[in-house]
């Protein structure tokens, strides 16, 4: 168990734990104090004791010992009184820290006393050697517990220069692969530096005497170190490995290192000392094996094999850990170690080896673990696990602390939990105690909640309630108990309505550049704070201040100016503080394809066959399959910026061989097309020019026509530049009279025409036009028939007669003309006709002529749209390409027809039952007028009760209708007549009902002079005449509101003038009809000094 921080008020004891200790190896130098450190924590306070070499050691009883009097320390210092005192205290120390819960133990501390270093007295004889031979100058420094540094110097304290020939070994000896006379010195001194004592001692100087020789003999390498052919080494895992090979020979050998058993780990290997030393950092298992050094010179080689075995000091696989336990639990301490050789593991309890403990202990040791079952407070202890092999020792202290603690609920009482229907609520009840308390949940009735399978408990005391329902709202009680006590808390649960998206966004496919609207509707619990947000591909979307890309409002997301990058998943997130629901829709943005990214030409050798291969990378399809690729070309020389399609290939194709034309400067581009249209074109290809060739086509539309009587102009449609097949093209024109079989005349021209002069009128010619360029001629051209120039026709069409079809149409017929007199191709006939006037009277107006063109194969025409009862003049002419020939003339008349409609029919109301009709005669009589027909019927009777009158006087302009119903509206129809019958009608609707009602003065106004006023109005069309009174009433105090006598006025008269008014006076004008007040207006007369005349043309009554 672990005591939670919130579990307060219980002062738990602590077993001893070593917090600081001296290193495992302690070297003491003559002038140093000895400090042995051992510190530990624990409650109650810790007591310390020491052993030396396994025997109880009491620091306080030793001379010169200072013990630190601090509660957590068992450390002590020994101060010496002579240089040799430390020897007395050498040994293996161990510290034990104890309190009532157990004993912790330090590791073994090996104390070693190092004396002052001295070189043993020796007489160093001179070393004599012949030039070229090898030599070893020994150093043999005194032994030292700490690593020391060796330097070779001369008496001037100058380092002996080392190189491939002269090397100091790891052992301190100075090796010469071969000596030179320059090595002859008497002061080779080996210096040993002891960092611990901060002292340097030196050996007696060595005198090296080199005898010169005239002939140095070459010799193959021999190893000076190691001397044998192989050696075995143990390397420690994690430590560096140093291998050394020093060779002699002449010339000086070079050293190489090999690893026959595998690759040399280049990242961890360094070569030092001119390759004589191999250092391998951080040795691992994989470094086990053979390493070989090879010394070589021009005479041969020597070798040494190092067989390296990698071993390891003990190291942890699983270190035992201290733990608290409650009564009844099982304690298990794992102690798993590894090393090479495999370490031996021993257990101690409170510092005592388990072998020395009584046999009735309840622990058992099983596969490297110490196990205690059903622990009780009396089983509290500190255990030690120790592992050792020949390379070292590993120690771990771990306690088993069995505590008894009362049950306590660490979750606050009376907490309120809120969750939504259908979700899972978690009611917390974190309890702690030792033994671990049991936890149970009860409802308000004190009944366990676990009868409902929706309620499920967790080991940590939490109660889960899944598929929440509204009636789960209420109070719940958590009860925690162990063998010491029991405690309870209450939890309140409120179940809210779950948030629901009632209408989520819908997946859609939209076009690039358009906008899309996603909508989202959700329902929320009314007591919760609702929120609707939008996400795009998992990112929160917001309206950006400086951009109108997104518009978010009222559950709507509008994305403007859609681009392909907007494609993705959009979701509406409806949330409250309790729940979140999300509804997702997919947006696909479609549009025309992207550009073809890359275009390559290949097989350029095919250009000689007017072909080339074009390949391209596929374009982005933008969610609509590419249907086809359009391959276009441009010729920058002949038509820059103009692109021509060479063809389309299916959308699954990305290359094609193109058929080209000779001598075109082709630059290609490719455009992808899908159902939305073409995309951007690819980058343009390189320009390639096809070799020249003779033309493959001749001009088309070859014609021969004269533009004068004595010539023939041969024309043709020039070849398009892409058919020239060369830089220029010319035309070989050939001609000869048709049917002569004589020689062809020919001319080569650059223009698309040729004029042949001095021809007879209208002679047929055979014509050929052939394309020609620098490479040759086009194919054999086809023969076309052309004609020399035409003359005006001399043929006069002979009229056969005119047939009157009706009053406005005639059929004209003539005989075909003699073609010989046409002097060209008969193109047709021109028929011209015009009206000379009515048969009633001849007009002197401007004559308008009409024309009809009749094809050459037709000899009749119908002239329609003529005016009845009129005289016409007619001309017919044959015409060819040159013009029209002489005309044949004729006159004819059209018979009478029915007249046009009468003009301007007016209805004037005479009384409630009578109307006066006024009209004007028709503009087109189309014959002799014989009178009028008047018809009328009430409107609401659907045409029944039609009455008709024949008015037989053609000069009649009015007609009075009586006995009309004042309550009906009528439809009036008036037609003029000739002997051919009645013509078109003029129609009006009206009656006395609408017109005789309340008088309407329409647009009434009043103007004034100095002593008069004119009242005027516009009588309404058809309004029945009536009489009314006009009364002028002066305003103002001095006038006393005097009125003039009322005047009787007729509606039809349109105006009325009132005389005898006062100058500069305001008047009110009142209009009465049958004593009913109908209208009121105001007017003011002018001041004096003006002419008193009413405006001209005003009637007075």
């Amino acid at each position: 168990i672990q005591i939670p921080e919130e579990y307060e008020g219980h002062h738990v004891m602590e077993p001893p734990v070593i917090t600081e200790q001296s290193p495992r190896r302690l070297v003491v130098f003559p002038t140093d104090d000895i400090s042995l450190k051992c510190e530990a924590s624990g409650k109650p306070e810790v007591q310390f004791r020491w052993t030396r070499d396994g025997v109880h050691f009491k620091p306080k009883e030793e001379l010169g010992v200072t013990v630190y009097q601090s509660p957590h320390s068992g450390s002590f210092t020994i101060t010496g009184n002579n240089s040799n005192f430390a020897q007395r205290f050498q040994g293996i120390y161990r510290c034990f820290a104890s309190n009532k819960l157990g004993t912790a133990m330090s590791h073994e501390i090996r104390l070693m006393a190092e004396g002052a270093p001295k070189w043993p007295k020796e007489t160093v004889k001179p070393v004599e050697v012949e030039e070229g031979e090898s030599v070893v100058l020994p150093c043999n420094p005194p032994p030292s517990a700490e690593p020391l540094r060796i330097y070779w110097m001369n008496s001037k304290i100058l380092h002996i220069k080392q190189d491939e020939r002269v090397t100091m070994g790891q052992n301190g000896n100075l090796y010469f692969a071969n000596v030179l006379t320059s090595d002859n010195h008497s002061d080779y001194i080996c210096h040993a530096h002891f960092p611990g004592t901060r002292t340097i001692i030196q050996k007696e100087p060595i005198d090296l005497r080199v005898k010169a020789t005239n002939s140095m003999i070459d010799r193959k390498p021999r190893l000076l170190f190691p001397t044998n052919s192989s050696s075995h080494l143990v390397a420690l895992q994690g430590q560096p490995l140093v291998l050394e090979c020093i060779a002699e020979g002449f010339p000086t050998p070079t050293i190489k290192w090999l690893r026959p058993s595998g690759p040399m780990p280049a990242d961890r290997v360094t070569y030092q000392n001119h390759n004589k030393t191999l250092q391998l950092l951080k040795v691992g298992e994989e470094d086990d094996g053979e390493y070989r050094c090879l010394a070589e010179n021009s005479l041969g080689s020597a070798r040494h094999a190092y067989y390296v075995t990698v071993e390891a000091a003990p190291y942890w696989l699983h270190k035992p850990q201290s733990h608290l336990y409650g009564p009844g639990e099982t304690a298990r301490l794992d102690c798993q170690v590894q090393g090479r050789p495999q370490p031996e593991v021993t257990w101690r309890i409170n510092g005592i080896p388990v072998e020395e403990l009584a046999k009735d202990q309840k622990y058992r040791i099983q596969r490297g673990a110490l196990i205690l079952s059903n622990v009780q407070p009396s089983d509290t202890m500190v255990t030690q696990c120790e592992a050792r092999n020949r390379h070292g020792l590993l120690l771990a202290n771990a306690y088993i602390y069995v505590v008894q603690l009362p049950a306590k609920i660490l979750t606050a009482d009376n907490q309120t939990y809120m969750a939504v229907q259908g979700s899972t609520a978690y009611l917390l009840c974190k309890a702690f105690g030792a033994p671990v308390p049991s936890v149970q949940w009860l409802d308000e009735d004190g009944t366990t909640v676990l009868q409902d399978e929706r309620f499920f408990p967790y080991a940590n005391g939490t109660l889960g309630i899944r598929d929440l329902q509204a009636n789960d709202t209420g109070r719940y009680f958590c009860l925690a108990a162990n063998d010491q006590n029991n405690v309870t808390i209450m939890a309140n649960l409120k179940v809210k309505d779950a948030t629901q998206i009632t209408q989520g966004p819908r997946s859609t496919i939209e076009k690039k550049g358009s906008r899309v609207t996603f909508t989202c509707q959700a329902s929320f619990d009314p007591s919760l704070q609702p929120s609707i947000t939008w996400r795009g591909d998992g990112r929160d979307l917001q309206e950006l201040g400086d951009s109108d890309k997104y518009f978010i409002e009222d559950g709507r997301l509008v994305i403007h100016s859609l681009d392909y990058s907007d494609q993705g998943n959009y979701s509406c997130v409806a949330s409250t503080e309790l729940d979140v629901v999300e509804s997702r829709a997919q947006l696909l943005v479609v549009g025309s394809p992207g550009p073809v990214p890359r275009l390559v030409l290949s097989d350029l050798h095919l250009l000689t066959q007017s072909q080339v291969r074009v390949s391209w990378s596929p374009a982005e399809d933008h969610n609509a399959p590419i249907e086809k690729y359009d391959i276009e070309f441009e010729d920058k020389e002949m038509a820059p910026e103009k692109w021509y399609s060479l063809g389309k290939v299916p959308g699954n194709q990305t290359s094609t061989t193109l058929k080209l034309s000779p001598y075109v400067h082709y630059t290609f581009r490719v455009t992808a097309i899908n159902k939305y249209g073409p995309g951007e074109p690819s980058p343009v290809s390189e320009t390639v020019v096809t070799p020249e060739a003779a033309p493959e086509k001749n001009p088309v539309d070859v014609k021969g026509e004269g533009n004068e009587t004595t010539n023939m102009v041969i024309t043709w449609k020039p070849l398009r530049w892409m058919d020239w097949n060369a830089p220029q093209v010319q035309y070989r024109v050939q001609w000869r009279p048709q049917g002569t079989r004589g020689p062809w005349q020919e001319q080569i021209v650059s223009d698309p025409f040729l004029v042949v002069s001095n021809t007879s009128t209208f002679v047929p010619y055979e014509i050929k036009v052939q394309a020609v360029n620098s490479q040759g001629k086009g194919p054999e051209p086809q023969v076309t028939i052309g004609y020399s120039g035409e003359d005006y026709p001399q043929a006069i069409p002979e009229l056969e007669g005119i047939e009157i079809l009706n009053s406005s149409a005639v059929l004209v017929k003539w005989r075909p003309v003699d073609l010989a007199q046409v002097k060209g191709h008969l193109r047709g006939y021109n028929v011209t006709y015009w009206r000379e006037g009515s048969q009633r009277k001849h007009s002197k107006r401007h004559i308008h002529k009409d024309h009809v063109v009749v094809p050459a194969n037709t000899t009749s025409v119908i002239l329609s749209g003529l005016r009845p009862y009129s005289s016409y003049h007619l001309e017919v002419q044959a015409f060819n390409g040159r013009g029209s020939g002489p005309a044949s003339e004729f006159t004819f008349s059209t018979p009478e027809g029915v007249p046009g409609h009468p003009e301007a029919l007016h209805l004037e109301c005479q009384s409630n039952t009578s109307l006066l009709l006024r009209w004007q005669p028709p503009l087109s009589h189309n014959g002799v007028l014989t009178g009028y027909v008047l018809s009328y019927h009430p409107l609401d009777e659907g045409g029944k009760g039609q009455l008709s009158f024949n008015l037989r006087d053609p000069e009649l302009r009015t007609h009075n209708l009586t006995d009309l119903s004042p309550h009906l509206r009528y439809r009036f129809q008036l037609q003029a007549t000739t002997k051919e019958g009645p013509g078109e009608a003029i129609v009006r609707e009206g009656g006395t009902m609408a017109l005789s009602g309340i008088s309407d003065f329409g647009n009434i106004s009043a103007t004034a002079g100095e002593n008069y006023s004119v009242v005027s109005w516009v009588p309404k069309e058809g309004q029945c005449n009536f009489r009314f009174h006009i009364l002028f009433k002066a305003l103002g105090e001095e006038k006393g509101g005097a009125s003039l006598s009322p005047q009787y006025v007729s509606y039809n008269q349109s105006s009325y003038t009132q005389w005898d008014l006062q100058p500069d006076t305001d008047y009110e004008i009142h209009l009465f009809k049958e004593r009913m007040f109908r209208h009121q207006m105001a007017v003011k007369t002018n001041g004096t000094g003006r002419v008193r005349l009413p405006p001209a043309g005003f009637a007075t009554e």
């Epitope: 390559v600 030409l601 290949s602 350029l604 050798h605 000689t608 400067h665 390639v688 020019v689 070799p691």
Partner: antibody, heavy 119, light 107 residues
Framework: QVQLVQSGAEVKKPGSSVKVSCKAS????????IQWVRQAPGQGLEWIGY????????DYAQKFQGRVTLTADESTSTAYMELSSLRSEDTAVYYC????????????WGQGTTVTVSS | DIQMTQSPSSLSASVGDRVTITCRAS??????VAWYQQKPGKVPKLLIY???TLHSGVPSRFSGSGSGTDFTLTISSLQPEDVATYYC?????????FGGGTKVEIK
């Protein structure tokens, strides 16, 4: 008359980059593609790639893909070739050449720029 | 890539001699072959294209022939100013490739 003038010789360290310029005159720069070719000491000619100065579209030999960048500046009628991650075997004379109008041939050449790569 | 193999790699001939250089393509290139001349210390110069078409300004003693995979450059009468290295180039397909060159010297 048509001229292509290249920048001066360069000495570079392995791993670095070099940028060679080629200034064109005497013709409309954007009408003709610029090709780049190199010649190692005592060796033959090796095509590097081309650029279209009017659209800046370029393509390279597979061997140089990812290491070479061809650019052009229409305002100064200058083409550039940048070669990165230089190695000793990139030591060569680098030529720019105008592509003949109509075929991938080299009708006008720059005087060449010697690039030496050495540590 | 299309390999272009030139032979010989060098030759020595006397002034007035007829000199022939051959070039072999590793695949059919039709007649899409050009020849260049590079004088010592100078830039290459276009001589022939479409295997046999003389570039403007090139003396008529130079001629080319061949199609498919085998091509020949001929100098009908060697002149001192013809001392140079001659390269063939295929332009049928990218990458454009050159032959290794033929060095022509005067004896």
């Amino acid at each position: 008359q048509v001229q292509l003038v290249q920048s001066g010789a360069e000495v570079k360290k392995p791993g670095s980059s070099v940028k060679v310029s080629c200034k064109a005159s005497g013709y409309t720069f954007t009408n003709y593609w610029i090709q780049w070719v190199r010649q190692a000491p005592g060796q033959g000619l090796e095509w590097i790639g081309y650029i279209n100065p009017s659209t800046y579209y370029s393509d390279y030999a597979q061997k140089f893909q990812g290491r070479v960048t061809l650019t052009a500046d229409e305002s100064t009628s200058t083409a550039y070739m940048e070669l990165s991650s230089l190695r000793s075997e990139d030591t060569a004379v680098y030529y720019c050449a105008r592509r003949q109008f109509g075929l991938p041939l080299f009708d006008y050449w720059g005087q060449g720029t010697t690039v030496t790569v050495s540590s | 890539d299309i390999q272009m193999t030139q032979s010989p790699s060098s030759l020595s001939a006397s002034v007035g001699d007829r000199v022939t250089i051959t070039c072999r393509a590793s695949q059919d290139v039709g007649t899409a072959v050009a020849w260049y001349q590079q004088k010592p210390g100078k830039v290459p110069k276009l001589l022939i294209y479409w295997a046999s078409t003389l570039h403007s300004g090139v003396p008529s003693r130079f001629s080319g022939s061949g199609s498919g995979t085998d091509f020949t450059l001929t100098i009908s009468s060697l002149q001192p100013e013809d001392v140079a290295t001659y390269y063939c180039q295929q332009y049928s397909n990218y990458p454009l490739t050159f032959g290794g060159g033929t060095k022509v010297e005067i004896k």
